[in-house]
């Protein structure tokens, strides 16, 4: 009788489809992830199963709490799609598909500087390029640890460019750039490049 009641409940909103989610949607290879399969019904003892494409990854029982499946994303095929099944006795429902985006982390970018010196000004062109890492890559330029450019998105493996004009400075300035893609909390920085304070021979980046 209980099985019949559960199946009837599944035809109503009492037993909707489970929800499959992860706090991390963008990952890099080798990263450990946790997947959460949860259900709105907190009173039923539910058996949760996790699938990737057409393989079964594991089964857990739960009541009131989401089932947590811990995985390591080491191969491209492990991006998904995943789906979760919630089962009560002989009745079951499936979640929507969930897929991770696998992103290669950016490598440290290289900053190049080109300067055109006039009597009063320096026209500076900054180039920044990270040769590895999934596109798009966002580049930001810094002067003395302060951002001087907006994030510049590059969808190809070409350097980001930023131009600025400065009065001939009285002190030396340090430039660097940051490269970041969709991987959260993962940014890399170029080595700093220092511009000397005075003109003449002490402007190694200047076009004569």
């Amino acid at each position: 009788r209980k099985a019949v009641l559960d199946c009837e409940a599944m035809k109503t909103n009492e037993f909707p489809s489970p929800c499959l989610d992860s706090k991390t949607k963008v990952v890099m290879k080798g990263q450990n992830v946790s997947m959460f399969c949860s259900h709105k019904n907190k009173s039923l003892q539910i058996t949760y199963s996790l699938f990737r494409r057409k393989t079964h990854l594991g089964t857990q029982d739960g009541k009131g709490e989401p089932a947590i499946f811990n995985l390591s994303i080491t191969e491209a095929h492990e991006s998904g799609p995943y789906k979760c099944k919630a089962q009560v006795t002989s009745c079951s429902k499936y979640s929507r598909d969930f897929s991770f985006t696998i992103v290669d982390p950016v490598t440290s970018p290289v900053l190049n500087i080109m300067v055109i010196q006039t009597e009063t000004d320096r026209h500076i062109t900054l180039h920044c390029l990270s040769v590895n890492g999934s596109l798009p890559i966002n580049y930001t330029f810094f002067e003395n640890h302060v951002a001087i450019s907006p994030a510049i998105s590059k969808y190809d493996r070409e350097p980001a460019e930023f131009n600025l004009t400065k009065k001939n400075p009285g002190e030396e300035e340090e430039y660097r750039c940051e490269a970041k893609n969709r991987l959260p909390n993962y940014a890399t920085y170029s080595h700093p490049v220092t511009m000397p304070s005075t003109g003449g021979d002490s402007c190694p980046f200047c076009l004569k």
Epitope: K54, T55, H56, G58, H77, S90
Partner: antibody, heavy 119, light 112 residues
């Protein structure tokens, strides 16, 4: 070259045990699923059980308890341990590999090994 | 237990004929399409023809096709060739009572 080679078949008495091996080459068992299938003389194909890339095992109802699938990643080999053998277990035993993340799309098969259960 | 009923159990046909084999499952396969078809010749291991109910495996001639969903599936050979005389099996994957697979009992295609 991707291939599977079964071994360990032969003549065994009723009630006896036998361990079959399935040696994989050209791919890693940590990525692919291996399934054991048998075929009695002149009969249908019969699913015995499966071990997936995570080491999870699954068995047909009739095989559960008597048959055990395991693997040794260092040898890239899967085993089928068969206990309490009966005359009706006489068959050619195949191991087969599934597609990545598709346990039962069996695209690579071994040549089979014959198990005869007789007194 | 899950039953995979294959029909007919045998059939005779001529080269050039269109041949249809069906598999009826007692329960829906996983994802409604977890079904594959195999060809087996005497003394040989089976060969994968169709997966995902309708997708052609690598290297399989286009005269083979699959269709169906849920519990009812069909393998069609549009124009039978001499090398197609063999036994054909379906294999379904299930998650209703554990993660489970079941073969149909085969259809033997012989020369008329």
């Amino acid at each position: 070259e991707v291939q599977l080679v079964e071994s360990g078949g032969g003549l065994v008495q009723p009630g006896g045990s036998l361990r079959l091996s399935c040696a994989a080459s050209g791919f890693s068992l940590t990525i692919y699923t291996i399934t054991w299938v048998r075929q009695a003389p002149g009969k249908c194909l019969e699913w015995i059980g499966t071990i997936n890339s995570y080491g999870n095992t699954y068995y047909s109802t009739w095989a559960k308890g008597r048959f055990t699938i395991s693997r040794d990643n260092s040898k890239n080999t899967v085993y089928l341990q068969m206990n309490s053998l009966r005359a009706e277990d006489t068959a050619v035993y195949y191991c087969a590999r599934g597609y990545v993340d598709s346990d039962w799309y069996l695209n690579i098969w071994g040549q089979g090994t014959l198990v005869t259960v007789s007194s | 237990a899950i039953q995979m009923t294959q029909s007919p159990s045998s059939l005779s046909a001529r080269v050039g004929d269109r041949v249809t084999i069906t598999c009826q499952s007692s329960e829906s396969v996983y994802d409604n399409n977890y079904l594959s078809w195999y060809q087996q010749k005497p003394g040989k291991a089976p060969k994968l023809l169709i997966y995902d109910a309708s997708r052609l495996a690598s290297g399989v001639p286009s005269r083979f096709s699959g269709s169906g969903s849920g519990t009812q599936f069909t393998l069609t050979i549009s124009s039978l060739q001499p090398e197609d005389f063999a036994t054909y099996y379906c294999l379904g994957g299930y998650d209703s009572s554990g993660w489970y697979a079941a073969f149909g009992c085969g259809t033997k295609v012989t020369v008329l």
